[in-house]
Amino acid sequence: DVNEAPQFSQHVFQAKVSEDVAIGTKVGNVTAKDPEGLDISYSLRGDTRGWLKIDHVTGEIFSVAPLDREAGSPYRVQVVATEVGGSSLSSVSEFHLILMDVNDNPPRLAKDYTGLFFCHPLSAPGSLIFEATDDDQHLFRGPHFTFSLGSGSLQNDWEVSKINGTHARLSTRHTEFEEREYVVLIRINDGGRPPLEGIVSLPVTFCSCVEGSCFRPAGHKHHHHHH
């Protein structure tokens, strides 16, 4: 009669929870049985993010830290079942925690928009296009961002118009701008549940141009035209 290791009821245990569950929430459980009828002690292996704790007696798994889908889902850890009261034989199974997205990331600019410029003086109103993104999951359809100016005082000089769910156009309302940098605040709303807003800044320089680039005295880098 050879002593056998515990046997898990499944090779892979899978559970699904919202990424915003409270710390201490039960997120799943695993079960193993020992062929000799001995009790089992459960432990986790590979919990690199430190998110989980297993009850070593019952096999119930609880969250011990905030979960974040954007860090990667599913979150995979190993579960070890060790025979209690005998030779300490053990078996290993997998626990996969699928994290359901919560709208918890505000919109932001999709790339670095430093270096935007218009040649001064403007001969006609100008415009430039920018793109927004966020780190939440958008199933079946892309993001549906809406765009507006970040403060009322900007409305005399600028207007923002939506192109599609991710892109918008920033346009000047007139041509009477000084030769300097203007910081234009844009409010981006993701329309999610709950809706999250990000206020981003687009720095736009009005400068004298030489061959289509901003002219700067020696020692300054050229700005490149983005519109």
């Epitope: 001995l38 002690s41 070593h56 007696v57 019952t58 119930e60 005998g86 300490s88």
Partner: antibody, heavy 120, light 108 residues
């Protein structure tokens, strides 16, 4: 025969810590879970946590997480419980108990209890 | 947490009388993980019945246990003087394991 011998009564001041012991004999200490349970007139029997001396695995009642630390010393077959930041509500009789090695999870042997009184 | 409600809280019985006390769980508990303990004043609890119906070593045969799901009971077929004590039910299906508030059995 199986015995769990607990340390003596403790009188401690609020805010202090206390460490109590539970010495096992008559069985293989590393092969059974040791549980800690407290008893108060108001709350009855409350499970605090458990440790498996074989590998140090432990589990805590969420209510006591941060308040309690469970350890086990294989060489002396002794389990320890440290209670921190004591208040008058922690005045109670604290029991250690052995969990049967069978899959019932029953606690088949209990220590005689350690009485903790928190008072200034 | 699974809440165990014991009734009655206090009861008295004459010697030789049949006694039944109940334990109701707030959610279903596997019968393997439902246990009863006896405690007398000044003493620690003793395992009395494990896995719903199995008598612990040294427990007299007049004791029995039964139940399933959310409803469990402990019965003494013929009350004896030494049975006067407090009886606690206990579940360890889910963590944290929980205890009932006890039924105190007195001699009438």
């Amino acid at each position: 025969q199986v015995q769990l011998q607990q340390s003596g009564a403790e009188l401690v001041k609020p805010g202090a810590s206390v460490r109590m012991s539970c010495k096992s004999s008559g069985y293989t200490f590393t092969s059974y879970n040791i549980h800690w349970v407290r008893q108060t007139p108001g709350q009855g029997l409350e499970w605090i946590g458990a440790i498996y001396p074989g590998n140090g695995d432990n589990s805590y009642n969420q209510k006591f997480r941060g308040k309690v630390t469970l350890t086990a010393d294989k060489s002396s077959s002794t389990a320890y419980m440290q209670l921190n930041s004591l208040t008058s509500e922690d005045s109670a009789v604290y029991y250690c108990a052995r969990q049967t090695a069978r899959t019932t999870r029953a606690m088949d042997y209990w220590g005689q209890g350690t009485t903790v009184t928190v008072s200034s | 947490d699974i809440v165990l409600t014991q009734s009655p809280a206090i009861m008295s019985a004459s010697l030789g009388e049949r006694v039944t006390m109940t334990c109701t769980a707030s959610s279903s508990v596997s019968s393997s993980y439902l246990h009863w303990y006896q405690q007398k004043p000044g003493s620690s609890p003793k395992l009395w019945i494990y896995s719903t119906s199995n008598l612990a070593s040294g427990v007299p045969a007049r004791f029995s246990g039964s139940g399933s799901g959310t409803s469990y009971s402990l019965t003494i077929s013929s009350m004896a003087a030494e049975d006067a004590a407090t009886y606690y039910c206990h579940q360890y299906l889910r963590s944290p394991p929980t205890f009932g508030s006890g039924t105190k059995l007195e001699i009438k």
